[in-house]
């Protein structure tokens, strides 16, 4: 696993890798918080779940997600964070066997139990933004990002490249 600063380095080094999306290039445990430093917490049972976006109590440990990094199998002409036209994608897992999924119909972010190979809905193109922030773009719906709406995670359509820096789709990854 590598630190946050290593994301950019690793992105640049992608062309050294022959892995093309079947297996992750690397995996990394990180806590996920919003641009405004609210924590993302996953309350997960067998048959139900809730995802909290809130200020965390001082004495509480932050939840972590397992980010698995993949190199996109399909070259992209879009200006992403890939190298040589390939893009860096991630899956996000808060606990064993569960992954975040994009439900484009409902514009919602969901948790689903599934086995590998994971469906496309579980993959997000990783964008490195300013101030050490990242954003997660749906593989299945370009231009749609994981974002925060009414203290919940939701899918948010970004109309233009200027809006890529809108705070509600920016997240921070931290090792602590």
């Amino acid at each position: 696993a590598f630190g946050i600063s290593g994301v950019q380095k690793y992105t640049r080094a992608l062309h050294d890798s022959s892995i093309t999306g079947i297996s992750p290039i690397t995996e990394y445990l990180a806590s996920l918080s919003t641009y405004n430093d609210q924590s993302i917490t996953f309350a997960l049972e067998d048959e139900s779940y809730e995802i909290y976006v809130e200020d965390l109590k001082k004495d509480e440990k932050k939840d972590k997600v397992l980010l698995s990094y993949y190199e996109s199998q399909h070259p992209s002409n879009e200006s992403g964070d890939g190298v040589d036209g390939k893009m860096l994608m991630v899956t996000l897992s808060p606990t064993k066997d569960f992954w975040l999924h994009a439900n484009n119909k409902e514009h919602s972010v969901e948790l689903h139990k599934c086995e590998k190979p994971l469906p496309d809905q579980a993959f997000f193109v990783l964008h490195n933004m300013h101030s050490n922030c990242v954003s997660f773009e749906c593989k299945t719906d370009p231009g749609v990002f994981i974002g925060v709406k009414d203290n919940h995670l939701a899918l948010i359509k970004v109309d233009s490249s200027e809006n890529l820096c809108t705070e509600n789709i920016l997240f921070k990854l931290s090792e602590t």
Epitope: L29, F42, L44, D46, K57, E60, D63, K64, K96, D97
Partner: antibody, heavy 126, light 106 residues
Framework: EVQLLESGGGLVQPGGSLRLSCAAS????????MSWVRQAPGKGLEWVSA????????YYADSVKGRFTISRDNSKNTLYLQMNSLRAEDTAVYYC???????????????????WGQGTMVTVSS | SYVLTQPPSVSVSPGQTASITCSGE??????AAWYQQKPGQSPVLVIY???KRPSGIPERFSGSNSGNTATLTISGTQAMDEADYYC?????????FGGGTKVTVL
């Protein structure tokens, strides 16, 4: 439906040993941390011990450290508490409890006790 | 070791509001849970994460937590609410319970 069924309680002499079991059903057992909580007759609740979903991490109250051992067999969906060097003050109803939520990668004891068994009585007396 | 202090007993008339306090150092920096235990029965979680109610728990149960005190409030108390109530937090990878409060509905 989540079910937790304790067994193994009984009368034991001071210095003796006893092994409690908790059979779990209705949920993915290996995904949840589990705990033992006890209640002496007429007294309040006291947390005793906990174990992570994989069994790789264990936690104990100071009052039982070195004497009690918590373990689990995920293939049998069963939680255990091995109690050695028992004392009169260990007399209590012992409850098995499941964390409300599945363990996050960060681990540790963090969640409330969402489900409880019916308890098994342990009496330590000569 | 970390100590949570509850009043031993609280009395309330039917339909009135019962408030049970749970005091501990910097309590508001932790998430509090509350359990109800009726005679001869196992405890039941009634409040978690300070304010949240599990499904099946009536709306008359509510919680708050700030400073050094967490509070469980039972609004419109009913005879069936007569029970022992325990607060609980996690501290340094251990579970810590308060001593319990017996709620009597007069």
């Amino acid at each position: 439906e989540v079910q937790l069924l304790e067994s193994g309680g009984g009368l034991v002499q001071p210095g003796g040993s006893l092994r409690l079991s908790c059979a779990a059903s209705g949920f993915t057992f290996s995904s949840y941390a589990m705990s033992w909580v006890r209640q002496a007759p007429g007294k309040g609740l006291e947390w005793v011990s906990a174990i992570s979903g994989s069994g790789g991490s264990t936690y104990y109250a100071d009052s039982v450290k070195g004497r009690f051992t918590i373990s689990r067999d995920n293939s049998k969906n069963t939680l255990y508490l091995q109690m050695n060097s028992l004392r009169a003050e260990d007399t209590a109803v012992y409850y098995c409890a499941r964390d409300l939520w599945m363990e996050n990668w960060v681990g540790g004891l963090r969640y409330p006790f969402g489900y409880w068994g019916q308890g098994t009585m342990v009496t330590v007396s000569s | 070791s970390y100590v949570l202090t509850q009043p031993p007993s609280v009395s309330v008339s039917p339909g009135q509001t019962a408030s049970i306090t749970c005091s501990g150092e910097r309590m508001g920096d932790k998430y509090a849970a509350w359990y109800q235990q009726k005679p001869g029965q196992s405890p039941v979680l009634v409040i978690y994460r300070d304010t949240k109610r599990p499904s099946g728990i009536p709306e008359r149960f509510s919680g708050s937590n700030s400073g050094n005190t967490a509070t469980l409030t039972i609004s419109g108390t009913q005879a069936m609410d007569e029970a022992d109530y325990y607060c609980e937090v996690k501290k340094s990878d251990t579970g810590v319970f308060g001593g319990g409060t017996k709620v009597t509905v007069l």
